[in-house]
Amino acid sequence: ARSEDRYRNPKGSACSRIWQSPRFIARKRGFTVKMHCYMNSASGNVSWLWKQEMDENPQQLKLEKGRMEESQNESLATLTIQGIRFEDNGIYFCQQKCNNTSEVYQGCGTELRVMGFSTLAQLKQRNTLKD
């Protein structure tokens, strides 16, 4: 099967020439998560951008040795985040800049939701809502 067919469903949705998966990840704090981008063409580097709010432009990530790692082979790029924290919450987009055309293709995004309570205040707020 062609890579387009293999990765369109359920692995990811087609956005231009890039298929990003999964679309959603929910994990507890401290876990490791991986998100992937599948490409038709290996003729360009893949990078990742991230945004927390729906209306903001995606931004670069902060590199932390031993916690964040990106890798890329011919048709697969992977972003790995170890020991996830609440500040990692957001939507992660992979993008490929093609060498020959300088066009940029962007994936549909992977939403990461880090589960658990980050502060005592949030825990109290949650209990208040339940009451």
């Epitope: 580097n45 990078s47 432009n57 995606p58 931004q59 670069q60 990530l61 590199l63």
Partner: antibody, heavy 121, light 105 residues
């Protein structure tokens, strides 16, 4: 093609001010952190300042803190460095640079051609 | 935070050149290396300790552990003669080494 072009350098007296500009093209400017790096004549590279893609965060070298201000206009794809209370030791080629990949605190893989600032009476 | 490099390194063509960069617990951070030729802007040759940007020859390699990062150029060519700078991030600030002039004899 990704390109950074600096301008605004020149000769200024000690205590004076100057504003450098860096025009960016070929990438989504507002998503990427930008930096100023300088190099005094015959000396090594010195990082000056960083600003986040949104402009909400900025960082400075101790040698320029309180005198220099980094800013950006994402609608114009332009980075600025406002330099006040200039000293002779600020004489250098000023480069606009940015990491174009996933991480804002990665290597500077895109550089401008530099603009010369001379502080002398 | 300071990064220390030897001011100069000499190598014969075809031989291996090694340039070191030392800093307190440098291995805990990622190191990058830049090449700069006279009158030109710097060019990154190694990033994230060991990674080579596209277009950089395979003879350039890097390592980083403990307190020392090393740039290795195997089969050094005359065109490799340049100044080399190491760089790392300490929290939110970037730090450059003093630079090493590589002379190809």
């Amino acid at each position: 093609e990704v390109q950074l072009v600096e301008s605004g350098g020149g000769l200024v007296q000690p205590g004076g001010s100057l504003r450098l500009s860096c025009a960016a093209s070929g990438f989504t400017f507002s998503s990427y952190a930008m930096n100023w790096v300088r190099q005094a004549p015959g000396k090594g590279l010195e990082w000056v300042s960083t600003i986040s893609g949104s402009g909400g965060s900025s960082y400075y070298a101790d040698s320029v803190k309180g005198r220099f201000t980094i800013s950006r206009d994402n609608s114009k794809n332009t980075l600025y460095l406002q330099m006040n209370s200039l000293r002779a030791e600020d004489t250098a080629v000023y480069y606009c640079a940015n990491p174009s990949g996933t991480f804002w605190n990665d290597a500077f893989d895109i550089w401008g051609q530099g603009t010369m600032v001379t502080v002398s009476s | 935070y300071e990064l220390t490099q030897p001011p100069s390194v000499s190598v014969s063509p075809g031989q291996t050149a090694s340039i070191t960069c030392s800093g307190d617990k440098l291995g805990d951070e990622f190191a990058s290396w830049y090449q700069q030729k006279p009158g030109q802007s710097p060019v990154v040759v190694i990033y994230q300790d060991t990674k080579r940007p596209s277009g950089i020859p395979e003879r350039f390699s890097g390592s980083n552990s403990g307190n020392t990062a090393t740039l290795t150029i195997s089969g050094t060519q005359a065109m490799d003669e340049a100044d080399y700078y190491c760089q790392a991030w300490d929290s939110n600030t970037a730090v450059f080494g003093g630079g090493t002039k590589l002379t190809v004899l």
